[in-house]
Interface confidence: low
Amino acid sequence: DAHKSEVAHRFKDLGEENFKALVLIAFAQYLQQCPFEDHVKLVNEVTEFAKTCVADESAENCDKSLHTLFGDKLCTVATLRETYGEMADCCAKQEPERNECFLQHKDDNPNLPRLVRPEVDVMCTAFHDNEETFLKKYLYEIARRHPYFYAPELLFFAKRYKAAFTECCQAADKAACLLPKLDELRDEGKASSAKQRLKCASLQKFGERAFKAWAVARLSQRFPKAEFAEVSKLVTDLTKVHTECCHGDLLECADDRADLAKYICENQDSISSKLKECCEKPLLEKSHCIAEVENDEMPADLPSLAADFVESKDVCKNYAEAKDVFLGMFLYEYARRHPDYSVVLLLRLAKTYETTLEKCCAAADPHECYAKVFDEFKPLVEEPQNLIKQNCELFEQLGEYKFQNALLVRYTKKVPQVSTPTLVEVSRNLGKVGSKCCKHPEAKRMPCAEDYLSVVLNQLCVLHEKTPVSDRVTKCCTESLVNRRPCFSALEVDETYVPKEFNAETFTFHADICTLSEKERQIKKQTALVELVKHKPKATKEQLKAVMDDFAAFVEKCCKADDKETCFAEEGKKLVAASQAALGL
């Protein structure tokens, strides 16, 4: 649809409240260091301009693209050069290069202070004093720390955030009501951000085709009763939505996501029997619910896959006529029959099938050549199955914290050049796969575990891309999206690594560790563990376990001491000496 004024079109479609919220998110995701007040001022200016265009679409500048309007507005920020350095050079460019330039400067790990949660009474007072500013500040703080957060979904989080304060600030025990809700929102928000980051990485690094393949597989698992043409339509629309959001086109993205939810609900009879409850909800809840909806039951009478994709004499003819469509159909048919497989496994199978057809359809006897293609799938299926079985056994044996430690050691030995904070963050998240997925029955373990690991390993990839230090990480991250996890799994100890010089300061602890939460204390200990492995990559599990046990005892002892700081100073020296001796440093 051609509209005289794109900004007026989106303002009318989305309404003023959503328009303002989405523009704030967009600006905060681009200019991550700007103060809140500056962003609010910019958003208000854009909103006032949009209203003039709603009143008269022919008014001056109303015909400009959103990228032009928003880019021009961002480029008015006075401190752009001082705050952002070379990002200011983007403003010398014309659209569309300017927007591409802004996108390239999004920072996955911005140098921002950790968000500290104020006292409950302080938060409730702020909420009551100015609800609008309070909620805008939430959007701003999340968006600037997560520059690829899925904007329409962030509106859903903000709605829940508001509901939590509305309910709990009136409760008898405000803290007991509010804090668990805020913890849940924080954890869900981090997970949502990481999932969306993988979608954007898929699009940006591997192309639209890669994203569409992922979407075909996932939607076919979720909607196995839907016909291929229906799934294809949903995939095309979903790809457009995520392309827009990943590309900073948040107004278009939110608008198109609403249209997609509307379409799905209007056509749920031909899509899935599980959508009824979702479709009765208001828009933001509806879209979220559809995105998380459980897999529909598989049709009972699905024929064997082999008939169309191996036994048919028309395989090469069908493949040659429309390669992407034929491979898409293969992926659809395989995925709808296998909700027990991870999406990445399904994509590996499709890639193997494609490679086989490329080779065999040029052979003298194509059918003879590809007749056993399904046999090639067996080892691909067994590899993640075995890996998940082994790791779930280890998780059940060790519990989450010690399982994380085992992964910390494993990954530090594989890629010791990676920064310690990144190794700790990524290994802790990898370790959460145990409590997240190992509780599931066999049929749900692989999709849960391997697709979650894809999300976590993507965090490693995007953090490493900012400051590359390891060729092995670069190789696993860039060669194949679907083989990232097997690539990392296959890495052995890096024999080329020169151990880090020993620095006693790294292992010096103070009494402040005693007042930390259990999680923060774990992170301190896990940081020390990574540093130990970097000093002594050949240390055995037993040696590392002994040192970590001594370390835990040392912290416990000194936190109980009357003069904690003296205890940490004196006992700490002894611990460092003992650890050096135990590890032969």
Epitope: H67, P96, E97, N99, E100, L203, Q204, G207, E208, R209, T243, C246, H247, D249
Partner: nanobody, 127 residues
Framework: QVQLVESGGGLVQAGGSLRLSCAAS????????MGWFRKAPGKEREFVAA????????YYRDSVKGRFTISRDNAKNTVYLQMNSLKSEDTAVYFC????????????????????WGQGTQVTVSS
């Protein structure tokens, strides 16, 4: 491999029109996203227009919108750039480019994502 050959360039008065063609040999163009780029003396190569392979979506740089039109004829294995209301700042060597795997629609502006390039055709607009 795809070989791309541009034609249709030349000298034209400001306000005039030209139609550039890009003919492909070696493989069918229907598999590719196609783009036009240009390079003026002393300037970086810049995106002009693009057309996608699946849905024929078109994208233009702001300064040529409404004046230039990109189109494709898969049967003739050719992509066109119709340039009207030409201005002196449109003077440049125009390159045709093809790419196999689209990333973003608006990322069509990214020249490093294109796999194949033509040699270029000179367009000079005199005032």
């Amino acid at each position: 491999q795809v070989q791309l050959v541009e034609s249709g360039g030349g000298l034209v008065q400001a306000g005039g029109s030209l139609r550039l063609s890009c003919a492909a040999s070696g493989r069918t163009l229907s598999s590719y996203d196609m783009g036009w780029f240009r390079k003026a003396p002393g300037k970086e190569r810049e995106f002009v227009a693009a057309i996608t392979r699946h849905d024929y979506n078109t994208y233009y740089r702001d300064s040529v919108k409404g004046r230039f039109t990109i189109s494709r004829d898969n049967a003739k294995n050719t992509v066109y750039l119709q340039m009207n209301s030409l201005k002196s700042e449109d003077t440049a060597v125009y390159f045709c480019a093809a790419r196999l795997d689209p990333i973003f629609a608006s990322n069509s502006a990214y020249s490093n994502l294109y796999d194949y390039w033509g040699q270029g055709t000179q367009v000079t607009v005199s005032s």
